[in-house]
C-alpha cells in the first residue's frame, strides 16, 4: 500500500487514455501512466480504490506502463489516477483521468434550428432529445478538442449557439448521460455548414464520418463536471 509523506514525494506522473477517453460499451481501452525511468511499481486507482498495478521489467522502458481494460462498462467508467514508486518513495497522484463509457441504453435525436446550412452570423440552436429520461445532455463537435457543452434536461435539451462564425462549422453529435461517465449511444451526426462572408465557402470537415474512437476530447473538471472552451461554449444555464 502507498504511504505518502508530504515532505518527500516524487513528481506526479502523467496519465492518458488511448484510443480515447470516450469508450464504447464492451470495447477495450489502454490507460498509460508515465513516471520515471527508475520506477519499480505503478499503481492505478479507480474512484479512489486500488484498481491495478504493474512492476515494469528492467528490460523494458520503465518510465511508463500500460494498463489494459479489456471491456469498458459502466462499472469501469469514472475517474482514474496513478502513482509510481522509486526506491522507498511514492509519487504524488497524477491528475485525474475521466473515462466515459458510451453506447448505453438508447439513442438520442439531434437536429439544428433553423436548418443545417446557415449564413454567417445567423442564430443557430441545436436540440437533443432522448426518450428515456436522463439528467444531462452533451453536445460534442468532432475533431474539436474541449468543444463540449452540457445541459440539464429531462427528455430534451437545447444548445443555443448564438450568431455563428466559421469556427462553428463541423459535425456534431449529442449524448444523453445517466451519470457524468455513462452516456447513451451517440446521435446521428449533424453537419453544420456556414455560407456567406468573405470566401463564401461552405466547406464541411474533411472527414465528417470519423469514428468516435478518434474524437479528440479532454474531459477535465470544472464545477459542472466538464471543461469547456470559454471562448466557444459559455452556456451553462440550468433548466
Amino acid at each position: 500500500q502507498r504511504i505518502n509523506t508530504e515532505k518527500e514525494t516524487l513528481p506526479k506522473p502523467i496519465i492518458w487514455a488511448k484510443p480515447s477517453i470516450m469508450v464504447t460499451n464492451g470495447n477495450s481501452v489502454n490507460i498509460w501512466c508515465q513516471g520515471a525511468q527508475s520506477a519499480s511499481e505503478y499503481q492505478l486507482y479507480f474512484e479512489g480504490s486500488f484498481f491495478a498495478l504493474e512492476r515494469p521489467k528492467p528490460s523494458r522502458s520503465m518510465n511508463k506502463v500500460r494498463f489494459f481494460i479489456s471491456q469498458m462498462t459502466s462499472h469501469t467508467a469514472g475517474i482514474y489516477t496513478c502513482f509510481y514508486q522509486s526506491g522507498e518513495l511514492w509519487s504524488k497522484s497524477s491528475n485525474p483521468l475521466k473515462l466515459v463509457v458510451t453506447g448505453l441504453y438508447d439513442t438520442p435525436n439531434l437536429w439544428v434550428y433553423p436548418r443545417p446550412e446557415v449564413t454567417l452570423g445567423e442564430n443557430v440552436t441545436f436540440f437533443c432529445q432522448l426518450k428515456t429520461a436522463t439528467s444531462k445532455f452533451f453536445l460534442l463537435k468532432e475533431r474539436g478538442s474541449n468543444h463540449i457543452q452540457n445541459k440539464y434536461g429531462n427528455i430534451q435539451a437545447e444548445f443555443p449557439m448564438g450568431p455563428v462564425t466559421r469556427a462553428h462549422r463541423g459535425t456534431y453529435r449529442c449524448f444523453g448521460s445517466y451519470n457524468d461517465y455513462a452516456w447513451s449511444f451517440p446521435s446521428e451526426p449533424v453537419t453544420l455548414l456556414i455560407t456567406g462572408g468573405v470566401e463564401n465557402s461552405s466547406l464541411a470537415p474533411t472527414d465528417p464520418t470519423s469514428s468516435l474512437d478518434y474524437w479528440e476530447f479532454d474531459l477535465s473538471t470544472n464545477e459542472s463536471g466538464l471543461q469547456k472552451d470559454s471562448a466557444f461554449w459559455d452556456h451553462t444555464t440550468q433548466n
Partner: nanobody, 119 residues
C-alpha cells in the same frame, strides 16, 4: 462445491478455464464472507507477477499452470475469518504484467467454492 477444513489447516483451490486464451489472461481470487462485500484475495499477471491482500500475505499463494489452463490458490494457516465463498476471475485479454486488484476489471467469473474453517 463446499470445502471443510480445520483451523490452522491447509487447502488448495483450483480453477480450470475453458478456451484457448488462458495464457493471455490475468487471473485473480476474490472471496465473499456471509453478510459482507466481495473482497480481493490474490492476483497473478500473465507473466506470473503476484499481489496479495494484506490479510492473506504469507499464508496464501497464487499460481498458474498455462498448460492446464488452471489457476491455484494454496491456502495455509487457515483461520475462522477465512470462511467465505471463494471466486476465481479472469481478465481476458490483458497486457504485459498487469495485475488487477479491483473486481470491476474482471470480465469472467467462476461459480464459487464455499470454504468453511472450523474454529
Amino acid at each position: 462445491e463446499v470445502q471443510l477444513v480445520e483451523s490452522g489447516g491447509s487447502l488448495r483451490l483450483s480453477c480450470a478455464a475453458s478456451g484457448r486464451t488462458f495464457a493471455s489472461a490475468a487471473m485473480g481470487w476474490f472471496r465473499q464472507a456471509p453478510g459482507k462485500e466481495r473482497e480481493f484475495v490474490a492476483a497473478i499477471s500473465r507473466s506470473d507477477d503476484t499481489y496479495y491482500a494484506d490479510s492473506v500475505k504469507g499464508r496464501f499463494t497464487i499460481s498458474r499452470d498455462n498448460a492446464k489452463n488452471t489457476v491455484y490458490l494454496q491456502m495455509s494457516s487457515l483461520r475462522a475469518e477465512d470462511t467465505a465463498v471463494y471466486y476465481c476471475a479472469a481478465v481476458v485479454p490483458t497486457y504485459g504484467n498487469n495485475i488487477y486488484v479491483h473486481s470491476a476489471a474482471y470480465n469472467y467469473w467462476g461459480q464459487g467454492t464455499l470454504v468453511t474453517v472450523k474454529p
